[in-house]
């Protein structure tokens, strides 16, 4: 729980947060996610880096891998084979993009306590995983896929056409990694390890983004990434499946694409194995309002995969794009043909549906003016999911269980009343057959992770309660936080306000708006955080507000799809509307209002500053998008359509930051970007700067050499220190 407020007699011993506290991560919290290996066992890395096996039923634990072994190869990660014979140890981690990295892998034999010698794995490896049963290995090296029947065996090469920046096998290219799969891998074992499915991405015709990486050499390096911007040529994707028992027998077999998808540009969106001989693929038209789920079966006689039209399920949106941020994935039931899936109901709220034959005949499982967010697990008799139903707060997450074995199905909230004040935002992790599960509570109080019985929901033990953090916060004057809503013109604007510790409604405070505002995002969440804005409220006496306007998620399609094909309009309007309402509350100094945001938030903050309202004195944009023509095709076109004359080029042109250069004249603007941003290219800020210079508008700027979209490491400290100075100067606060 948040430490309770102390009375004046003790207030002298309390101190405000400092910027140093934030930059040092003094008040960071821990979570505990068990690495499940069976219904009742999990692995966990202990504080002293031993890998320990816990048996919930016996209460016993023992070390299966010592820290000495881990240290011998500088391992930072591990993975136990399902037959418990081997562990892979991962070292030499080298980050690539958001999810991808390369590493060196060593295989340790637990039976004899030695590393496997002979036929060692090549280095560096792009992805490696065990089969779901036994100890087969699949890995990707130099964009090709390899298979080992046993760790000590020589590898079998599955693909041969892999080429850097051209053909990717078993791993996604840049745009599929960031905007479609959200993983570092693009290969999937069948449940018993008989088959291996994989994607091949052909980037041959994709235009390349090139930027300088300055490094320490005499000449900078040029980084080249095939990166399709809006309207550009996209990757060509194909899905193959190979029999891993006899991989050389027939080789990889291509899975056919549904005809209605293949007729124009399309994407592959996900693959879900149902059984060893049934697989479900999801495809999406390039214009992302039509998605097709295709269930395919293995034909033993032909050794091919058959995807009958009768097993194609179409999901279409008439008011926006298909799905939320991504199209949801199915969770199959035990009959291996019917499944549960989240999609919009007739009232425009995302809910769980049960599909047995056709989508038209789907049975709606949840309903109401709230949204189902994730299906965690389906067992023979229960379905576990999360939603924001409880007490009508869209920024909460509770875990529910629906009994599907009985009729009518009964619903129980597993988490709603557990630690009601402390915990309102949960996720969960389930063991095999949901015999046990871990709950991870993210707030609003201090996070806590607990272990529960999957049948009774009884709490078995606390896995992590962040006692040290609780003690460390005892003498800190934390800001107050409140989550409320504004009703404006039939739109509900939820906001979070962070108030200085000694907040007094009769006084006037500077206001900082923190904005993200991207489609299907949510900023107003009941989670714990001690971060930069906590410091600004605690030490510098600012009021900070976050507002979820049109385009944001989990409040129905009307709000979500309001921004369809017109990004940069309503998101900005709603921030401005909220600021006006905050001023009406009487405690905001209207001469000291600022806005800041990062990425999409940098775009919104820039447009808000250039809105000509006179509301904002100053603002900051970190790594902003400045024109949707500069951003990735998969993301941009989902919400904006194509930048062509016969589609939506006009709004692409109207929604740029550059077009509003003149309007920055009356605000103080700080523009910040990393020069090695692979995601929102430095080009975006370069163009803003050019437009401001051409308009003879003064502004401040900071670049971070060789830094990507995250501005990590020492850059983080410099960034927040720099932004703090800028805001304090803007608000006339003494340094």
């Amino acid at each position: 729980l948040r430490p309770s407020r102390v009375h004046n007699s003790e207030e002298n011993t309390m101190r405000a947060l400092t910027l140093k506290d934030i930059l040092n991560g003094t008040f960071s919290y821990k979570t505990f996610f068990p690495n499940w290996i069976s219904g009742q066992e999990y692995l966990h890395q202990s504080a002293d880096n031993n890998i320990v096996l816990y048996n919930i039923e016996t209460g016993q634990s023992y070390t299966i891998l010592s820290n000495r072994t881990m240290k011998s190869v500088n391992a930072s990660n591990y993975g136990l084979s399902p037959d418990r014979q081997f562990v892979y140890l991962e070292s030499d981690y080298s980050k690539l993009w958001r999810y991808s990295y390369t590493a060196t892998y060593y295989i340790y034999d637990l039976s004899n306590g030695e590393f496997v010698r002979g036929n060692e794995l090549p280095r560096p490896i792009q992805y490696l995983c065990w089969s779901p049963v036994g100890s087969k290995l699949a890995y990707v090296y130099q964009n090709n896929i390899y298979l080992k029947q046993r760790p000590g065996d020589p590898p079998f090469q599955i693909t041969f056409n892999g080429r850097e920046n051209k053909i990717f096998n078993g791993i996604p290219d840049w745009v599929y990694e960031e905007e479609m799969l959200a993983t570092k891998y693009a290969l999937w074992w069948s449940p018993n390890g008989k088959f291996l499915a994989y994607a091949e991405f052909n980037d041959t015709d994709i235009p390349v983004i090139a930027y300088s990486y300055y490094g320490d050499e005499q000449y900078p390096r040029t980084i080249n990434i095939p990166y399709p911007k809006a309207g550009a040529k996209n990757p060509v994707v194909r899905i193959f499946i190979i029999d891993t028992t006899y991989p050389a027998y027939v080789g990889p077999q291509e899975v056919p694409v549904p005809a209605m998808i293949a007729s124009s540009d399309y994407y592959f969106s996900w693959l879900t194995w149902v059984t060893d001989e049934r697989v479900c693929l999801q495809w999406l038209k390039r214009v992302q309002n039509v998605s097709v789920l295709s269930i395919c079966d293995f034909r033993e006689d032909w050794q091919t995969w058959d995807c009958p039209k009768t097993q194609e399920h179409i999901e279409e949106s008439r008011t926006g794009w298909a799905g939320g941020f991504f199209v949801s994935t199915p969770v199959f039931s035990y009959d291996a043909i019917s499944y549960y899936k989240i999609f919009s109901d007739k009232d425009g709220y995302k809910h769980i549906h049960y599909i047995k034959d056709t989508v038209e005949n789907a049975i709606q499982i949840t309903s109401g003016k709230w949204e189902a967010i994730n299906i965690f697990r389906v067992t023979q008799d229960s379905l576990f999911y999360s939603s924001n139903e409880f007490e009508e707060y869209p920024g909460r997450r509770n875990i529910y269980r629906i009994s599907i074995g009985s009729y009518p199905p009964s619903k129980k909230c597993v988490t709603c009343h557990l630690r009601k004040e402390r915990c309102q935002y949960y996720t969960a992790s389930f063991s095999d057959y949901a015999k046990y599960y871990a709950l991870v509570c993210y707030g609003p109080g201090i996070p806590i992770s607990t272990l529960h019985d999957g049948r009774t929901d009884q709490e078995i033990k606390i896995l992590e309660e962040n006692k040290e953090l609780e003690n460390a916060l005892k003498n800190i004057q934390l800001p107050k936080e409140e989550i409320k809503k504004l009703e404006v013109d039939e739109i509900t604007l939820w906001y979070k306000m962070i108030l200085p510790p000694q907040f007094d409604r009769s006084k006037k405070y500077p206001l900082l708006i923190q904005v993200y505002g991207g489609p299907c995002s949510q900023s107003v969440r009941s989670v714990f955080a001690v971060n930069w804005i906590s410091y600004l409220a605690s030490k510098e006496g600012m009021v900070i507000a976050l507002v979820d306007g049109r385009g944001t998620a989990f409040q129905g399609d009307k709000l979500l799809y309001a921004v369809y094909r017109k990004l940069g309009v309503y998101e900005v309007e709603d921030q401005i509307t909220a600021v006006r309402k905050f001023i009406e509350m009487g405690f905001i100094d209207e001469k000291r209002i600022a806005i800041w945001g990062w990425s999409y938030g940098g775009y919104v903050s820039s447009l808000a500053l250039a809105s000509g309202t006179g509301l904002f004195k100053c603002g900051i944009a970190v790594a902003p998008v400045s024109s949707w023509e500069y951003y990735a095709s998969v993301y941009t076109e989902r919400f904006m359509g194509l930048p062509t004359k016969d589609d939506n080029l006009e709004h692409y042109k109207n929604s740029t930051v550059m077009a509003r250069a003149e309007y920055f004249r009356n605000v103080d603007y700080l523009l910040i970007h990393g020069t090695a941003d692979d995601n929102v290219h430095f080009q975006n800020s370069a163009q803003i700067a050019k437009a401001l210079v051409n308009a003879q508008v003064d502004f401040q700027a900071m670049w971070y050499s060789d830094q990507n979209h995250g501005l990590s490491g020492l850059s983080t400290n410099h960034l927040y220190t720099h932004m703090t100075h800028f805001l304090k100067q803007c608000f006339s606060l003494s340094d």
Partner: nanobody, 116 residues
Framework: QVQLQESGGGLVQSGGSLRLSCVAS????????MGWYRQAPGNKREWVAG???????NYADAVLGRFSIFRDNPKNTVYLQMNSLKPEDTAVYYC??????????WGQGTQVTVSS
């Protein structure tokens, strides 16, 4: 620390059967998953079969369909039923937790010899 005692080994002809037993000095149900391992002369120790406390079983490819592992919790015993034995099954057989504990010790094992 639970002490483990293997028994039931012996000399058997190719195609024959043996049943190995492993008795735990502590309560076996208080131990998680149990496994059988073997070490042939000149080779490294390798895993043969495993059974979880819930009764789920798993086998090495080399013994799949020929060996079966089962447990009798009240008797604190884990068994390995070995059928259709082959000369290449000749080894010292050990039982231990599955996977074995880094800091645990191995028992004496029981010798299985399969003659052709």
């Amino acid at each position: 620390q639970v002490q483990l005692q293997e028994s039931g080994g012996g000399l058997v002809q190719s195609g024959g059967s043996l049943r190995l037993s492993c008795v735990a000095s502590g309560s076996i149900s208080s131990i998680n998953a149990m496994g059988w391992y073997r070490q042939a002369p000149g080779n490294k120790r390798e895993w043969v079969a495993g059974i979880t406390s819930g009764g789920s079983t798993n086998y090495a490819d080399a013994v799949l369909g020929r060996f079966s592992i089962f447990r009798d919790n009240p008797k604190n015993t884990v068994y390995l039923q070995m059928n259709s034995l082959k000369p290449e099954d000749t080894a010292v057989y050990y039982c231990n937790t599955w996977p074995p504990s880094t800091f645990g010790s191995w028992g004496q094992g029981t010798q299985v010899t399969v003659s052709s």
